[in-house]
Interface confidence: medium
Amino acid sequence: MGRARDAILDALENLSGDELKKFKMKLLTVQLREGYGRIPRGALLQMDAIDLTDKLVSYYLESYGLELTMTVLRDMGLQELAEQLQTTKEESGAVAAAASVPAQSTARTGHFVDQHRQALIARVTEVDGVLDALHGSVLTEGQYQAVRAETTSQDKMRKLFSFVPSWNLTCKDSLLQALKEIHPYLVMDLEQS
């Protein structure tokens, strides 16, 4: 989808400093769909428009992130900005619908983990939870510590993926199971892409 993320970023960059602050405050109290978590207050208040966009997309994925941004903007009385996002939502929805084919008619090869390597590196944020699920059963103590030692989520995921070539299918399934529990909406989003 991509363009949804860009549209969220455009909207947030159009906000004044006070408006962005107000947006964050409303984001802390807005009604969320069942199953979605709230971005922690401490981290949220420190974010600039770019960081906030990334967080919105990683927490809520592009489609719902866009919808949530529209809701908050409308609540702030910024109808024009919200309408611009609505246009993006409709356009990207049409593109997604046109591109979608039934999963069963597509003979996909390779495991989910291999298919979506880049997206997982870019979008998995709760890496430590994933590592804990794999510790002992899939990752050795040394591998676990090596991944933990990396500073950013992306570097941690890159390090984790450096071990994947030696894994068998059940190891990959263990990673996928951890992702399904920790990032269920990301998995659903990627599975449909």
Partner: antibody, heavy 122, light 107 residues
């Protein structure tokens, strides 16, 4: 088309072992996991585990670890399940099944063997 | 292990009726749920996967819905060939688990 052909019914004595086969045709054997389920009389379905012929790895339901051993023979495109130390509790119909697609752990079973009835009786 | 509770365990309905079978998961399984039909003496047949996707060749009178812990299978305009036992199955985590089944009979 995809077919899973299971071995015939077995009547075995308590304490003995049995090995059930599931011969695959209609697709590349090493591309897909083969899962095993059972159904006891008047009971629901239970998942036993899977074997991935591509690398030989297997995943088991802990309840069946030690009871069932899953293997695969690439040369004959056949998956096997050996059941050990059989008791009357193991009397059931055993199914092999293949998922809709191999892409991930979304195990929706679109293709099934016809079932093998195992009866454990003295 | 995730427990899958199906209700009712048996159901009697008339031809042409719309019936609903429910499946409750003991924890959140998102949309990772499928439904199977098993007729007496036959093998299980996949009807619906990922909560609401109709499998190829399955009549459109079958539909599925739900996410999280609550799911339903609906059969509209019941036909004689729908007499069977229906099972739900979760694909969220290992071990994969099935519901106890709902036996559907015609009045």
């Amino acid at each position: 088309q995809v077919q899973l052909q299971q071995s015939d019914a077995e009547l075995v004595k308590p304490g003995a072992s049995v090995k059930i086969s599931c011969k695959i045709s209609g697709y590349t054997f090493t591309d897909q996991t083969i899962h095993w389920m059972n159904q006891r009389p008047e009971q629901g379905l239970e998942w036993i585990g899977y074997i991935y012929p591509g690398d030989g790895s297997a995943m088991y339901n802990e309840k069946f670890r030690g009871k069932a051993t899953l293997t695969a023979d690439k040369s004959s495109s056949t998956a096997y399940m050996q059941l050990n130390s059989l008791t009357s509790e193991d009397s059931a119909v055993y199914f092999c099944a293949r998922p809709l697609y191999s892409y991930a752990s979304y195990y929706w079973f679109a293709y099934w063997g016809q079932g093998t009835l195992v009866t454990v009786s003295a | 292990d995730i427990q899958m509770n199906q209700s009712p365990s048996s159901l009697s309905a008339s031809l042409g009726d719309t019936i609903t079978i429910t499946c409750h998961a003991s924890q959140n399984i998102n949309v990772w749920l499928s439904w199977y039909q098993r007729k007496p003496g036959n093998i299980p047949k996949l009807l619906i996967y990922k909560s609401s996707n109709l499998h190829t060749g399955v009549p459109s009178r079958f539909s599925g819905s739900g996410s999280g812990t609550g799911f339903t299978l609906t059969i509209s305009s019941l036909q004689p060939e729908d007499i069977a036992t229906y099972y739900c199955q979760q694909g969220q985590s290992y071990p994969l688990t099935f519901g106890g089944g709902t036996k559907l009979e015609i009045k």
